[in-house]
């Protein structure tokens, strides 16, 4: 893969360990966590970016209305279990052997329960809607403009292929991102959706994940974009499977 | 819709040998494409795959001898080195690919012979 | 990830019905195909995604299973059934053994 060649490090993961022990003497680097071999020419998973997180010190209405069946991310960081492919295991557990079921982006789809708790299929997250709402500025951002803006950061920042952009919505001050990707027609070397979406969230947070770069400076027409509050709604390809007790 | 593969034949051990799988009848650019083999008598053995947008992914035994690529617009090749017994098998080309669509391979050529024999 | 595929032979009388096993080295979450393969000809696909039927293939053949666990059933056995057959796992791409599975063939009494 291309890790930085000259100074062996990993332009698109900066929590990662690389050296010049691949074959033939190439940069080969490693996520910090699991020492799992990755791929710099494109986006790290969010399992392994999450397992590294958790490993390093602690210090460091043209709306679109979610669906009933919408997840947001409630239960925060964990340590999370990835599978030989760097993809989040479909069952999770913590060390006091609570167990429960996560979807591709590892956010919890069902009710936590014991170790005899079964998760059969790691169910793909196919429609990411990021909810974000940007800081006062003199007039509204042109929606044309804001849209364009948007697409771009996703194809050339994380990647991500256009067609998986579904839409932009804009009504001041919300903006709305909606990134579907449906489990046919992802391809392989594809960006996934929720890569891409956690790299934009912390990216947002002021906490890039990218090697060497400045932070995120997002501007429409030479207009910065600064984001106040950012809210991300994930919708499963299958339902979650929640109690009636926690929906109420 | 068809898959042709071609190239194959007799090679002494230690020889280079390159396969080619020719398309028609389809979208290549939006189709992944893999390399199946099968030596006689044996079961079906996964080589690796190219994506639609280039990335190549291999078995663990094949990383190293074996280079899959896309030549033209209709062609994808399987390129062999250091050729030993071992790799006398008939050798499909397929399409479809791992962890990609529906993650199975719909469409298959007859194959190509590669005998590796001194 | 790897696949190992039992029994290695299978036989039953015409009307009859088999079944074949394919175990994962890690859950593959539905992402398995079935194929049937006769001598001097390329394998041709049965189901994917565990249990959807490739196109033109009757529906004797029912494929079932999750997580790491998968099954071949094929019912009212036919001559024509007689084969092997192979599972391949679609979820595993970068760190993939064997996609396929040792195959099973099938003897039609």
């Known amino acids: 893969h291309t890790a930085a060649q000259d100074n062996c490090t990993c332009p698109t993961n900066k929590m990662t360990v690389c050296s010049p022990d691949g074959p033939g003497g190439r940069c080969q680097c490693r996520a910090l966590g699991s020492g799992m071999a990755v791929d710099c020419s494109t986006l790290t998973s969010k399992c392994l970016l999450l397992k590294a997180r958790m490993s390093a010190p602690k210090n460091a209405r043209t709306l679109v209305r979610p669906s009933e069946h919408a997840l947001v991310d409630n239960d925060g960081l964990y340590d999370p279990d990835c599978d030989p492919e760097g993809r989040f295991k479909a069952r999770q557990c913590n060390q006091t052997s609570v167990c429960w079921c996560v979807n591709s982006v590892g956010v919890r789809r069902t009710d936590k329960g014991d170790l005899s708790l079964r998760c059969d299929e790691l169910v793909r997250t196919h429609h990411i809607l990021i909810d974000l709402r940007h800081r006062p500025t003199a007039g509204a951002f042109n929606h044309s403009d804001l849209d364009a803006e948007l697409r771009r950061l996703f194809r050339e920042r994380y990647r991500l292929h256009p067609k998986f952009v579904a839409a932009v919505h804009y009504e001041q001050p919300t903006i709305q991102i909606e990134l579907r990707q449906n489990t046919s027609q992802k391809a392989a070397g594809d960006v996934d959706i929720g890569d891409a979406a956690y790299y934009f969230e912390r990216d947002i947070k002021g906490e890039s994940l990218f090697q060497g770069r400045g932070g995120l400076d997002l501007r429409v027409r030479g207009e910065p974009l600064q984001v106040e509050r950012t809210l991300i709604y994930y919708l499963d390809e299958i339902p979650p499977k929640f109690s009636m007790k926690r929906l109420t | 819709q068809s898959l042709e593969e071609s190239g194959g034949g007799l090679v002494q051990p230690g020889a280079s040998l390159t396969l080619t799988c020719t398309v028609s009848?389809?979208?290549?650019?939006?189709?992944?494409m893999t390399w199946v083999r099968q030596a006689p008598g044996e079961g079906l053995e996964y080589i690796g795959f190219i994506g639609i947008r280039g990335n190549i992914y291999y078995a663990n035994w094949a990383k190293g001898r074996f280079t899959i690529s896309k030549t033209s617009s209709t062609t994808v090749t399987l390129q062999m080195t250091s050729l030993t017994v071992a790799d006398t098998a008939t050798y499909f080309c397929?399409?479809?690919?791992?962890?990609?669509?529906?993650?199975?391979?719909?469409?298959w050529g007859p194959g190509t012979l590669v005998t590796v024999s001194s | 990830y790897d696949m190992t595929q039992t029994p290695a032979s299978v036989s039953a009388a015409v009307g009859g019905t088999v079944t074949i096993n394919c175990q994962a080295s890690e859950s593959i979450s539905r992402y398995l195909a079935w194929y049937q393969q006769k001598p001097g000809q390329p394998p041709k696909p049965l189901i994917y995604r565990a249990s959807t039927l490739a196109s033109g293939v009757p529906s004797r053949f029912k494929g079932s299973g999750t997580g790491t666990d998968y099954t071949l059933t094929i019912s009212d056995l036919e001559c024509a059934d007689a084969a092997t057959y192979y599972c391949q796992q679609g979820y595993g791409y970068s760190t993939v053994g064997n996609a396929f599975g040792g195959g099973t063939e099938v003897v039609v009494k």
């Open positions: 009848g389809f979208d290549f650019s939006s189709n992944a």
């Open positions: 397929a399409r479809g690919g791992l962890w990609t669509g529906n993650s199975y391979f719909d469409l």
